[in-house]
């Protein structure tokens, strides 16, 4: 039961984490204009991985996509790549972990196969989380560097009375979403790996069970394989149940072979 709970919780935490990574990647507020010196501004700039925006004091917001690929900073490209890799790995991990969930019956899948799938998805979640954390951290580092550079050159004199005030950018909401989401995905992955250890059967003990069927004799073999007297032998429309031996943790319900809890 504890294994099922750990696996289920790991899945849910990872699911929330990956949803957060996707949200962070799509968000426009990776960096926002620093308002330390001027808390009320007529034009508020903020930037994402895919476009940059301005919110005017008039209430209007306008965004411009980065329509160039080669002209973008290498660091931004790297962050994009890390976030996308994180999302892809996370999505595959989710897909794998759905089939690995102990509470879902997929045909006659053995526990060892589920354990392997759980471990695989766990590793994928861990790598996905690390990618997201790395991506966000690289961007944050880039912001910090640029912040202090623009502070040093806050007013770059152009001679005479004209001056260009550089817009300084600080951490946006997406960075915090990304860090938290990456952390959750990482934690979910670790939980899946822990659950994998409990899933892996150390030794398989089959209990000998004797079944007595009235009328036709039906032989039951452990392992989920069904033997009957022949194609037309079930004349009284009796159900022939898949009576393979089960571990104590498993619950069987009929007639569906896909048991969604």
């Amino acid at each position: 039961m504890a294994v099922t709970a750990c696996q289920g919780l790991g899945f849910v935490v990872s699911l929330i984490g990956i949803a957060g990574i996707i949200a962070a990647t799509c968000m426009d507020q990776w960096s926002t204009q620093d308002l330390y010196n001027n808390p009320v501004t007529a034009v508020f700039n903020y930037q994402g991985l895919w476009r940059s925006c301005v919110r005017e004091s008039s209430g209007f917001t306008e965004c411009r996509g980065y329509f160039t690929l080669l002209g973008l900073p290498a660091m931004l490209q790297a962050v994009r790549a890390l976030m996308i890799v994180g999302i892809v790995l996370g999505a595959i991990g989710l897909l794998v972990s759905i089939f690995a969930l102990k509470c879902i019956r997929i045909g006659s899948m053995e526990d060892s196969a589920k354990a392997n799938m759980t471990l695989t998805s766990g590793i994928m979640f861990i790598v996905s989380g690390l990618c997201a954390i790395a991506g966000v951290s690289v961007f944050a580092n880039m912001l910090v560097t640029n912040f202090w550079m623009s502070t040093a050159n806050m007013y770059t004199g152009m001679g005479g009375m004209v001056q260009t005030v550089q817009t300084r950018y600080t951490f946006g909401a997406a960075l915090f979403v990304g860090w938290v989401a990456g952390g959750l995905t990482l934690i979910g992955g670790v939980m899946m790996c822990i659950a994998c250890r409990g899933l892996a059967p150390e030794e398989t003990n089959y209990k000998a069970v004797s079944y007595h069927a009235s009328g036709h004799s039906v032989a039951y073999k452990p392992g989920g394989f069904k033997a009957s007297t022949g194609f037309g032998s079930n004349t009284k429309n009796k159900k022939i149940y898949d009576g393979g031996a089960r571990t104590e943790d498993e619950v069987q319900s009929y007639p569906s072979k896909h048991d969604y809890v």
Partner: antibody
Framework: QVQLVQSGAEVKKPGASVKVSCKAS????????VNWVRQAPGQGLEWIGM????????RLNQQFKDKATLTVDTSTSTVYMELSSLRSEDTAVYYC???????????WGQGTLVTVSS | DIVMTQSPDSLAVSLGERATINCLSS????????????LTWYQQKPGQPPKLLIY???TRDSGVPDRFSGSGSGVDFTLTISSVQAEDVAVYYC?????????FGQGTKLEIK
């Protein structure tokens, strides 16, 4: 069509106060900021401040922080500007204007002449 | 505060000729987020409120004749009237919409020669 209709001309004594109104129609009142701009006789334009009708949030030119108070009555779609401690240099035409994209002022009231004279 | 300086103070142009008014800002009006310049041009005729001509430095407001055009970026901006008409006699103002407080140029008076 969009209209901003201002109250009539006022003559005030120095030290007195005056409240100028600006009634908006033809658009969703609570969606746009309303500005106040003044123009002294034969002079240029000077921005006083702006108010957002939905939450009465204001942005005020620091030069006018002790002079102007901007308020809103959403039930009548009216914006008010109260000028206190009037002096002769406050004699001007006061305009209200709606804020449009680009922080530009697209629709203007006809103006209210406030004359401060002893 | 951003200081807006217009030149010339007054301008006399013959009908059908081109008129050019310049506006210099003490600070860049270019927003990095959308690469727009927050500069606005107004026309004010005697006894009337100002009328919006151009915003974002080059975007004409609806109903403004296409003889009016705006250009420039950063700190240096220009309003051009390609073929001056009699009804264009007015005072023209530029305005900073980039930072509070919004500030206006001192105005340029356009007259017919």
């Amino acid at each position: 069509q969009v209209q901003l209709v201002q109250s009539g001309a006022e003559v005030k004594k120095p030290g007195a106060s005056v409240k100028v109104s600006c009634k908006a129609s033809g658009y969703t009142f609570t969606n746009y900021w309303v500005n106040w701009v003044r123009q002294a006789p034969g002079q240029g334009l000077e921005w006083i401040g702006m108010v957002h009708p939905s939450g009465s949030e204001t942005r005020l030119n620091q030069q006018f922080k002790d002079k102007a108070t901007l308020t809103v009555d959403t039930s009548t779609s009216t914006v008010y500007m109260e000028l206190s401690s009037l002096r002769s240099e406050d004699t001007a035409v006061y305009y209200c204007a709606r804020v449009w994209s680009g922080n530009a002022f697209d629709y203007w009231g006809q103006g209210t002449l406030v004359t401060v004279s002893s | 505060d951003i200081v807006m300086t217009q030149s010339p103070d007054s301008l006399a142009v013959s009908l059908g000729e081109r008129a050019t008014i310049n506006c210099l800002s003490s600070q860049s009006l270019l927003a990095s987020g959308n690469q727009r310049n927050y500069l606005t041009w107004y026309q004010q005729k005697p006894g009337q409120p100002p009328k919006l001509l151009i915003y974002w430095a080059s975007t004409r407001d609806s109903g403004v004749p296409d003889r009016f055009s705006g250009s420039g970026s950063g700190v240096d901006f220009t309003l051009t009237i390609s073929s001056v008409q009699a009804e264009d006699v007015a005072v023209y103002y530029c305005q900073n919409g980039f930072s509070f407080p919004f500030t206006f140029g001192q105005g340029t008076k356009l007259e017919i020669k």
